[in-house]
Structure formats: structure tokens, C-alpha cells
């Protein structure tokens, strides 16, 4: 806590500018008006304040807004955002996507911090659902964001938002998460034609049931081995050799290298040897 001291004569800040970097902490506390700071927050980022000086500026804002900062201030926090605690952020009401983007930009290139996680949580809860624009923004900054959500949280994602999801956004999702996302993706892409549909749905197929895999096998899709290996074992097991051959197309040649790994291993054990022999790969059931 910086103790209250009178501002020296002639040092009262008329605006937020570079001259303030020469102020001691107590001078900033005494000579910078919190209301002035709040209206000129956009200037703070252009001035090379020390971390100690930023602490003083944060303290002034905290005093001015004990119930939480208004969005007009939040949007211009810039590097001051890094000084905020999750407790501070829980007091905020962030509704503008532009504000969210501005704050995520500050943390860009770093892991998702507790502050950012809290900010995102507040923003999404405020919106009521994870809409497409929000998801687009969040996955651009944090490709693993979607897979950090619980199946319950994912259930609030509307099918229309699925259009914003890129394959890499699903890399770390587990089967339970894909079980939630797959039906939404199926609904979102239902009006696309065969080959375009497969390109879009491919990343979500770890949540697909057997019936859908059987249907895909009739569409000449040529699923690659990496995708096949991520399918649910229980969904793969009922597929016949002919269906797997049609589903994979030229990629079926890759089954040999994966014969000891799930789901291929379990699937092989379910097949008749005569059927496996038709694949020409020496697979042993």
C-alpha cells in the first residue's frame, strides 16, 4: 500500500504522458487522478512504465472502481491486464468481443494463464453460449481451447459454431468430448455434398457411431490411417473387412503397420481369417 502524500507543486498530471515515467511511485499515487487515468487508459500502453509503476496505476483504478472496472477501461488495459488477478477479473462484465480480443492479444504466445481462463469464463457465461465468433477468436489464440472444456460445457456449443473449428483445435480432445461435438458437427455440415462433408466432419469422427462409419464407407471417402486410429473402438469393431476396405480406400495398406495398436488390433481379432486375407497384408486374426 502506497501511503497518502500530497502532490509536489507543479507535478499534478494534466494528462497521461511520457513525463510520468520519471515519477516515483508515491508521486504517481499523489499526482495522477484516477478518473483521468480511466479516461486515458489507451495511452498507458504507449508509455514504458516499470512494473512497480503499473502496480500504482492498478491500485488507483481499484480504488476508483471497487466493484469492478467498466468495459471502457477494461478494453484499454493492455499490459496492465497482466497485473490483474482472477479475483479482480471475476468482478468484470465483459460483453464486447473487441475487448476480449484486446486482452487476449496481451497474453498472446503464452500458455493460458488463470487470468485469461477467468476472463474467457466470464465472457462466455455473459453471452450464454459459445457462439461462432467467440469460438473463432478463442481458437485463434488458443488452438487447444475447445478440448479444455468439459463435455458439459461443450454441450452449450451451438451447431452453428462448429464451422469455426479447425482440425488442430481438436487434437487434444478425448473421446468423451468428441462424443458431444460429433452430433453437433453432423448437424452443422448436413447440407454439404459427400466429399466436402467428409473433409469437414473428419476431425470429429472420434465421436462417430458405427452406423455413420458404415454410411461413410459407401461414399468413397478414403479415410486416412491417422483418422481411423482415433475412431471409437466400439464403433469400429462391428465393421466388416469390406466396409473397412471401402472406408479407407488406398489407406487400407496402412493397417499392417498398425496391427498391434487399437482399434486395429481389436478389430482384426473380430474378423474371419478368410476375410482378412482379402486385404493382401498378411494380417492374422
Amino acid at each position: 500500500e502506497v501511503e497518502k502524500t500530497a502532490c509536489p507543486s507543479g507535478k499534478k498530471a494534466r494528462e497521461i504522458d511520457e513525463s510520468l515515467i520519471f515519477y516515483k511511485k508515491w508521486e504517481l499515487e499523489a499526482c495522477v487522478d484516477a478518473a483521468l487515468l480511466a479516461t486515458q487508459m489507451d495511452r498507458v500502453n504507449a508509455i514504458p512504465f516499470t512494473y512497480e509503476q503499473l502496480d500504482v496505476l492498478k491500485h488507483k483504478l481499484d480504488e476508483l472502481y471497487p466493484q469492478g472496472y467498466p468495459e471502457s477501461v477494461i478494453q484499454h488495459l493492455g499490459y496492465l491486464f497482466l497485473k490483474m488477478s482472477p479475483e479482480d477479473i471475476r468482478k468484470w462484465n465483459v460483453t464486447s468481443l473487441e475487448t476480449l480480443k484486446a486482452l487476449l492479444e496481451v497474453n498472446k504466445g503464452h500458455e493460458m494463464s488463470p487470468q485469461v481462463a477467468t476472463l474467457i469464463d466470464r465472457f462466455v457465461k455473459g453471452r450464454g453460449q459459445l457462439d461462432k465468433d467467440t469460438l473463432d477468436t478463442l481458437t485463434a489464440f488458443y488452438p487447444g481451447y475447445l478440448c479444455s472444456l468439459s463435455p458439459e460445457e461443450l454441450s452449450s456449443v451451438p451447431p452453428s459454431s462448429i464451422w469455426a473449428v479447425r482440425p488442430q483445435d481438436l487434437d487434444t480432445c478425448d473421446p468423451r468430448q468428441l462424443d458431444v461435438l460429433y452430433p453437433k458437427a453432423r448437424l452443422a455440415f448436413q447440407n454439404m455434398n459427400g466429399s466436402e462433408y467428409f473433409v469437414k466432419i473428419q476431425s470429429f469422427l472420434g465421436g462417430a457411431p458405427t452406423e455413420d462409419l458404415k454410411a461413410l464407407s459407401q461414399q468413397n471417402v478414403s479415410m486416412d490411417l491417422a483418422t481411423f486410429m482415433k475412431l471409437r473402438t466400439d464403433a469400429v469393431l462391428p465393421l466388416t473387412v469390406a466396409e473397412v476396405q471401402k472406408l479407407l480406400g488406398p489407406h487400407v495398406e496402412g493397417l499392417k503397420a498398425e496391427e498391434r495398436h487399437r482399434p486395429v488390433r481389436d478389430w482384426i481379432l473380430r474378423q474371419r481369417q478368410d476375410d482378412l486375407d482379402t486385404l493382401g497384408l498378411g494380417l492374422q486374426g
Epitope: D224, L225, Q245, P250, H251, E253, G254, K256, A257, D277, T278, L279, G280, L281, G282
Partner: antibody, heavy 121, light 107 residues
Framework: EVQLVQSGAEVKKPGASVKVSCKAS????????MHWVRQAPGQGLEWMGN????????YYNERFRSRVTMTVDKSTSTAYMELSSLRSEDTAVYYC??????????????WGQGTTVTVSS | DIQMTQSPSSLSASVGDRVTITCKAS??????IAWYQQKPGKAPKLLIH???ELQPGVPSRFSGSGSGTDFTFTISSLQPEDIATYYC?????????FGGGTKVEIK
């Protein structure tokens, strides 16, 4: 010992077809797909396609799809590659190659000695 | 299809020199690359698979490294019998593709 023995050199006229054979021995023919690769004079290697010897199902490089036919005769452990509508650019050495499925889709560990096909009027 | 860009297309080096050839894939191929040596009038001979695994009987002066899209093949000390053309092959996709080749000559 694994061996892939190909048929002899061929000289063909433009517009004709050529059929190259590749007889396999030393392994179970139906346990490995057979691939075909060609090499034009002074040029690099070009993958043409492959065939499942068990069910005769081929997959072709898009570039050759309209002109190539790959077949097998399981009884003699022989794979065939026929190329039709020959043109001078098809003058090349044609190789059959067997993959080893140690990882992913497999790399070629055994090759035939190559068959030279010359297309000339 | 995955394109494999190999460079240089030819090189000339002295016996004992270290020779380096690179292959760049148009997309991520993990470590699924093999290297072949081809001498005139002969079929290609497999030297290395899975980026760096040496085939039995291949001299240890041959080595490979890389992952993703960028790969390197090295001859640590060039020998007269190494005069040949070298090719990379990607097998991360069933539709295999080769690099354009590098012709290695002795100065």
C-alpha cells in the same frame, strides 16, 4: 531370399500398349501389395500405383489413371502393369517394388531389376 | 498429393568431404521418409527408412535426420563408391512420392 524378376525390354510404337510382368518369389505373394515405379531417361523416380495381390484391387497415380491397368496372377505370383496409348514420353525403365510395412504405409525394400520400354516410331 | 522438394539437384565434392542433401515435404509427414541410392543401370537401393534408421549392411557414414517437413541426408565422409543419384521417398501417404534426386559426383 526375396526376388522380383521382371520381363525383358520392349520397343513399341506410339499409340500401342505394353505389358510388363514382375514375378515374385521368396515370400508370400498375397501378403504384400505390389507397386510400380517408372524412371524416364535422366529423370527421377515416379510412383505409378499399386495393387492388392489378394483381391486384385488397384490404386493408381492420378497422372496414369486413364491409361494404366495393374493386374495379378496369384497362381504364378506374378504382377502385371499395362500402359496403353503409348507416347514418346513413356520411354522409361519400369520397376516393380515391394513395400515393407514397418511404419505408416511402408517403404520399398525390394525392387525388380527394371524393364526398359522404348516408344519410338 | 504430397510434394517432395529435394536439393541440390547435383553436387560435386571431394573424397572425404561431408555431403548433405535436403528434402522438404509440402506437408507434415512425421518421420516417414526413406532414402535410396541409385547407380546407373541399377534399381534403387534402400539406405535409410523412418528418417534415420540405417538398413542392415549400409555403412555408418550414411545418416538421416529431421521430422515434420524438413529432412536431411548426410554422407559424413564421401567415398568413391558413393558416386550415385540419391532420392528421398515419403510414405506418410499411400500415394508415395519421391524427391527429384541429387546426383553426387567426385571433384
Amino acid at each position: 531370399e526375396v526376388q522380383l524378376v521382371q520381363s525383358g525390354a520392349e520397343v513399341k510404337k506410339p499409340g500401342a500398349s505394353v505389358k510388363v510382368s514382375c514375378k515374385a518369389s521368396g515370400y508370400t505373394f498375397t501378403n504384400y501389395w505390389m507397386h510400380w515405379v517408372r524412371q524416364a531417361p535422366g529423370q527421377g523416380l515416379e510412383w505409378m500405383g499399386n495393387i492388392n495381390p489378394s483381391n486384385g484391387g488397384p490404386y493408381y497415380n492420378e497422372r496414369f489413371r486413364s491409361r494404366v491397368t495393374m493386374t495379378v496372377d496369384k497362381s504364378t505370383s506374378t504382377a502385371y502393369m499395362e500402359l496403353s496409348s503409348l507416347r514418346s514420353e513413356d520411354t522409361a525403365v519400369y520397376y516393380c517394388a515391394r513395400p515393407y510395412y514397418g511404419s505408416s504405409y511402408g517403404y520399398f525394400d525390394y525392387w525388380g531389376q527394371g524393364t526398359t520400354v522404348t516408344v519410338s516410331s | 498429393d504430397i510434394q517432395m522438394t529435394q536439393s541440390p539437384s547435383s553436387l560435386s565434392a571431394s573424397v572425404g568431404d561431408r555431403v548433405t542433401i535436403t528434402c522438404k515435404a509440402s506437408q507434415d509427414i512425421n518421420k516417414y521418409i526413406a532414402w535410396y541410392q541409385q547407380k546407373p543401370g541399377k534399381a534403387p537401393k534402400l539406405l535409410i527408412h523412418y528418417t534415420s534408421e540405417l538398413q542392415p549392411g549400409v555403412p555408418s557414414r550414411f545418416s538421416g535426420s529431421g521430422s515434420g517437413t524438413d529432412f536431411t541426408f548426410t554422407i559424413s565422409s564421401l567415398q568413391p563408391e558413393d558416386i550415385a543419384t540419391y532420392y528421398c521417398l515419403q510414405y506418410a501417404n499411400p500415394l508415395r512420392t519421391f524427391g527429384g534426386g541429387t546426383k553426387v559426383e567426385i571433384k
